[in-house]
């Protein structure tokens, strides 16, 4: 999906209002400095591409983020403010329908959510103080 035509201001507002709080709750008890930055983004559409990938694509060590509250809200926000996004996600949603018991949060999932927080921070601000 090409995130170029999303309403970035609306997505930013949703992030600040709800998604950020859910991410921070998930990370509670963990310092952001506990993990080094392993993923970056270079403009707002690129940030959303990487946020989508980290949030919804299962990885071998952290398979269940898509079921978390912040992920559901992220999906709703992208569907609301990115034209045509929800249509591209129908197949992915059907694949996720079989729900399992939520696993205990692993260190790898904490690391992944730490990277997500970093990507969102890059998305919501004009990154560089100058230039």
């Amino acid at each position: 999906y090409d995130f170029t035509n999303c309403d970035f201001q609306k997505i930013e507002a949703d992030y600040l209002r709800t998604i950020s709080k859910d991410l921070i709750t998930y990370m509670s008890g963990t310092k952001s400095t506990d993990f080094n930055n392993t993923v970056s983004c270079s403009n707002r559409p690129h940030c959303l591409t990487e946020i989508q990938s980290l949030t919804f694509n299962p990885t071998p060590r952290c398979a269940s983020l898509a079921k978390e509250m912040f992920a559901r809200k992220t999906k709703a926000t992208l569907a609301l403010w990115c034209p045509g996004y929800s249509e591209t996600q129908i197949n992915a949603t059907q694949a996720m329908k079989k729900r399992r018991k939520r696993k205990v949060t692993t260190n790898k999932c904490l690391e992944q959510v730490s990277q997500l927080l970093g990507l969102w921070r890059r998305f919501i601000r004009t990154l560089l103080k100058k230039q």
């Epitope: 930055n37 993923v39 970056s40 270079s42 990487e50 890059r122 560089l128 103080k129 230039q131």
Partner: antibody, heavy 122, light 108 residues
Framework: QMQLVESGGGVVQPGRSLRLSCAAS????????MHWVRQAPGKGLEWVAV????????HYADSVKGRFTITRDNSKNTLNLQMNSLRAEDTAVYYC???????????????WGQGTMVTVSS | SYVLTQPPSVSVAPGQTARITCGGN??????VHWYQQKPGQAPVLVVY???DRPSWIPERFSGSNSGNTATLTISRGEAGDEADYYC???????????FGGGTKLTVL
């Protein structure tokens, strides 16, 4: 463990070519800008080139423009520097480094490789 | 193109404060980054965006930037701080990375 490992250095005659490589691991390579920086023996750091995270755009120092080419393969997590028409003044340790970027602005180089030595001598 | 000027050397007594300057035309309008390099080793980022510090760098390292001068401050100097220090900016008009000439810090 985030890591950059350079290879390909060696001794080469003036006018000849050499290709350096940098293998990245432990981070999402395709999301970072990547640089080559060199350091002549006993001298300071000299920036050589940078390539955008996407590989679509490159920038070079005047001293290497037209002779050196920076490329990347995001599917293999590798960065390359093709060095042609080498001169004695290209003798240096060559480092690769990663840099987040925002639009067309590159930020600090937060991870560096250990370097590979290139000696241009007849 | 843009030029950054550093003093070739700075000395500090153990436990005292060292200040390394980096001069450039209106450098205060740019983000300055500082690197430490010990002999035979790769550079290490110690301060970025004028005054921010990577999580692995001690609080003794700090930075400031205004006008035509950026400054790296190392408080409570230790023998392990002996190294070459380089300032760096991104020149967005010429699309170039620019390094200062480097400053050798000696802890007496």
């Amino acid at each position: 463990q985030m890591q950059l490992v350079e290879s390909g250095g060696g001794v080469v005659q003036p006018g000849r070519s050499l290709r350096l490589s940098c293998a990245a691991s432990g981070f999402t390579f395709r999301t970072y800008g990547m640089h080559w920086v060199r350091q002549a023996p006993g001298k300071g750091l000299e920036w050589v080139a940078v390539i955008w995270y996407s590989g679509t755009t490159t920038h070079y120092a005047d001293s290497v423009k037209g002779r050196f080419t920076i490329t990347r393969d995001n599917s293999k997590n590798t960065l390359n520097l093709q060095m042609n028409s080498l001169r004695a003044e290209d003798t240096a340790v060559y480092y690769c480094s990663r840099s987040p970027q925002w639009e067309d602005i590159f930020e600090s180089m937060d991870i560096w490789g250990q370097g590979t030595m290139v000696t241009v001598s007849s | 193109s843009y030029v950054l000027t550093q003093p070739p050397s700075v000395s500090v007594a153990p436990g005292q404060t060292a200040r390394i300057t980096c001069g450039g035309n209106n450098i205060g309008s740019k983000n300055v980054h500082w690197y430490q390099q010990k002999p035979g080793q790769a550079p290490v980022l110690v301060v970025y965006d004028d005054s921010d510090r990577p999580s692995w760098i001690p609080e003794r390292f700090s930075g400031s930037n205004s006008g035509n001068t950026a400054t790296l401050t190392i408080s409570r100097g230790e023998a392990g701080d002996e190294a070459d220090y380089y300032c760096q900016v991104w020149d967005s008009s010429d699309f170039l990375v620019v390094f200062g000439g480097g400053t050798k810090l000696t802890v007496l």
